[in-house]
């Protein structure tokens, strides 16, 4: 068992068919020493009386507030969480495997640029008695800090039958240099709580690995004389780390029809502009990636070709 | 505004050519190196991560950009560091910060140099011959550093006596690999930004 | 199976012209770009211009401009090329050559030898 | 017009060894760089697109690497099979051109 927060304890588990459990033992937070009672939740029925409390810890019904009370008045409260290992393994129930880049990804996260600035996000089922909290470091034997914000629902989806639900979080690096050379990956720890389960979820990278650099901005069109092709230009997105000739991008030119299947006219270029042959109802799309670390590519932005 | 662009020309700024050629020849090494030694430990987040260039070289201090230097956490190692305008030690002065800027990669590249020579003598020696040093990487680097034009001492190829460990030696060569990619994207950084000013 | 079938060799005075044909088949016709590249023998691969079937668009090499021109007739699934003025140096193996991607070629043409002779 | 430089012209290979063949551009190409193997009296066939991308049913021994104005096809064990002439096509901008060939032969 260990606290969580104040008053908040988490019970770990073996979770398998008659397990033993853990045996816990309460202890009232008061000075008083006789004529406590225990009770749990919203339950009147005592369960013990003394200071402090012995309990067999074997499922959930275990589980929730516990309350030490002397005459009618509460003295403290103690919140049981459980936190399953299955064939040695802690439970996953309460977020989704979003299977991308690897199996077992609960958290993602992406960086706009180099300021040490980042957004992590995941994705539940569940839609009530939810809370999460996160932590986050530069190393974990020296950890050096990351500030987070509070996680919140950032997106609803409905997907089949069910409604999934996106909640992100936005940390900062205290001290980031945009040039440094990273050595010690970030740290990222989300605990989980779904009623009286507990679990907790972490995330390791580098800021470099995840960058994502925003789509292009100002995309415009400028037909050349007597041809088919046409001048598109664009700038670098806002976000993106300066001195850009420092932190230079690199660019992919689309031009496609609605459909993906259709035919296409690509070209690469490190410059802001490019040549490209325009079709009848297509779209030219730009995107960005890091010119020297490749990373992901930016999202699409794109104006129509006529 | 908008920046030049970092077109190759070699007599503007051969440097960035070559540093271009760098980041090439160090990737495809460390992806031919991540492919072969697939039950190897090899890959970002399998190895430790260690620069064999710390506390000897300063090349992010050096070499940061001008606007940088009002970031108080890129100066934490250094008083004042920045680079100015100027070629790759050809023709014109330079400034004496880029001078720094410049030595310090010419020292990195002489670091790695050896440390990949001595381990491609162990490599050598292993009977399965599972992985060699890229020749075209070694030759990249040695151009830039002719590039960058530096006279300094000659560091001697460390030779052992002791028989090669050679798991440990092929662990040591994604280490490198790794922290090398990494500088010599700062690397390309830096000659990208010199060309642009 | 995506396969092009080109017409066969010719022979041809200097002075007159030469069309190539080259019939698509597995795919549809208008889903690709269809280019012209020609290889004098003995010699490197040239490059002479694209036709969008869907819509007509061309668009030539300035070498041959004038000179060649690409015509698409979608109900067939056949591409034609034309060079007019023919002289020596156009004796060349000519290839068509398709993509669902404008500026390179997935899917060659088995070529079509033109041999201009006086 | 963009001009492709290949070399060498000629390579003689050994069967097993390795083989790189470069390709040079006269201006920046980005990753505009395709690779295309033609065997005598036969139409050129694509081996790799955007300087470094495979194609499905060509061996995995064919490779590309570069960027820029400098790129190699990489050939890592060379099979009787692949004795062959092999060039380099730049799609930066119009008109396209081509390298003026390497033919790989045997030592």
């Known amino acids: 068992i260990w606290e969580l927060k104040k008053d908040v304890y988490v019970v770990e588990l073996d979770w398998y068919p008659d397990a033993p459990g853990e045996m816990v033992v309460l202890t009232c937070d008061t000075p008083e020493e006789d004529g406590i009672t225990w009770t749990l939740d919203q339950s009147s029925e005592v369960l013990g009386s003394g200071k402090t409390l012995t309990i067999q810890v074997k499922e959930f019904g275990d589980a929730g507030q516990y309350t030490c009370h002397k005459g009618g008045e509460v003295l403290s409260h103690s919140l049981l969480l459980l936190h399953k290992k299955e064939d040695g393994i802690w439970s996953t129930d309460i977020l989704k495997d979003q299977k991308e880049p690897k199996n077992k990804t609960f958290l993602r996260c992406e960086a706009k640029n180099y300021s040490g600035r980042f957004t992590c996000w995941w994705l539940t089922t569940i839609s009530t008695d939810l809370t999460f909290s996160v932590k986050s470091s530069r190393g974990s034997s020296d950890p050096q800090g990351v500030t987070c914000g509070a996680a919140t629902l950032s997106a609803e989806r409905v997907r089949g039958d069910n409604k999934e639900y996106e909640y992100s979080v936005e940390c900062q690096e205290d001290s980031a240099c945009p040039a440094a050379e990273e050595s010690l990956p970030i740290e990222v720890m989300v605990d989980a709580v779904h009623k009286l389960k507990y679990e907790n979820y972490t995330s390791s990278f580098f800021i470099r690995d995840i960058i994502k650099p925003d789509p292009p901005k100002n995309l415009q069109l400028k037909p050349l004389k007597n041809s088919r092709q046409v001048e598109v230009s664009w700038e670098y997105p806002d976000t993106w780390s300066t001195p850009h000739s420092y932190f230079s991008l690199t660019f992919c030119v689309q031009v496609q029809g609605k459909s993906k299947r259709e035919k296409k006219d690509r070209v690469f270029t490190d410059k802001t502009s490019a040549t490209v042959i325009c079709r009848k109802n297509a779209s030219i799309s730009v995107r960005a990636q890091d010119r020297y670390y490749s990373s992901s590519w930016s999202e699409w932005a794109s104006v129509p070709c006529s | 505004r908008n920046l030049p662009v970092a077109t190759p020309d070699p007599g503007m700024f051969p440097c960035l050519h070559h540093s271009q050629n760098l980041l090439r020849a160090v990737s495809n090494m460390l992806q031919k190196a991540r492919q072969t030694l697939e039950f190897y430990p090899c890959t970002s987040e399998e190895i430790d991560h260690e620069d064999i260039t710390k506390d000897k070289t300063s090349t992010v201090e050096a070499c940061l950009p001008l606007e940088l230097t009002k970031n108080e956490s890129c100066l934490n190692s250094r008083e004042t560091s920045f680079i100015t305008n100027g070629s790759c030690l050809a023709s014109r002065k330079t400034s004496f910060m880029m001078a720094l800027c410049l030595s310090s990669i010419y020292e990195d590249l002489k670091m790695y140099q050896v440390e990949f020579k001595t381990m491609n003598a162990k490599l050598l020696m292993d009977p399965k011959r599972q992985i060699f040093l890229d020749q075209n990487m070694l030759a990249v680097i040695d151009e830039l550093m002719q590039a960058l034009n530096f006279n300094s001492e000659t560091v001697p190829q460390k030779s052992s006596l002791e028989e090669p460990d050679f798991y440990k030696t092929k662990i040591k060569l994604c280490i490198l690999l790794h922290a090398f990619r990494i500088r010599a994207v700062t690397i390309d950084r830096v000659m990208s930004y010199l060309n642009a000013s | 199976q995506v396969q092009l079938v080109q017409s066969g060799a010719e022979v041809k005075k200097p002075g007159s012209s030469v069309k190539v044909s080259c019939k698509a088949s597995?795919?549809?016709?208008?889903?690709?770009?269809l280019h012209w590249v020609r290889q004098a023998p003995g010699q490197g691969l040239e490059w002479m211009g694209w036709?969008?079937?869907?819509?007509?668009?061309?668009e030539y090499a300035p070498k041959f401009q004038g000179r060649v021109t690409i015509t698409a007739d979608e109900s067939t699934s056949t591409a034609y090329m034309e060079l007019s003025s023919l002289r020596s140096e156009d004796t060349a193996v000519y290839y068509c050559?398709?993509?669902?991607?404008?500026?390179?070629?997935?899917?060659w043409g088995q070529g079509t030898l033109v041999t201009v002779s006086s | 017009d963009i001009v492709m430089t290949q070399s060498p012209l000629s390579l003689p290979v050994t069967p097993g060894e390795p083989a790189s063949i470069s390709c040079r551009a006269s201006?920046?190409?980005?990753?505009?760089l395709h690779w295309y193997q033609q065997k005598p009296g036969q139409q050129p066939r694509l081996l790799i697109y955007?300087?470094?991308q495979s194609i499905s049913g060509v061996p995995s021994r064919f490779s590309g690497s570069g960027s820029g104005t400098d790129f190699t096809l990489t050939i890592s064990s060379l099979q009787p099979e692949d004795f062959a002439t092999y060039y380099c096509?730049?799609?930066?901008?119009?008109?396209?051109?081509f390298g003026q060939g390497t033919k790989v032969e045997i030592k």
């Open positions: 201006q920046s190409i980005s990753i505009n």
């Open positions: 096509q730049q799609s930066n901008s119009f008109p396209l051109t």
């Open positions: 597995g795919g549809t016709f208008s889903d690709y770009y």
């Open positions: 050559a398709r993509n669902k991607e404008l500026r390179y070629f997935d899917v």
């Open positions: 036709i969008d079937p869907e819509n007509g668009d061309t």
């Open positions: 955007f300087a470094s």
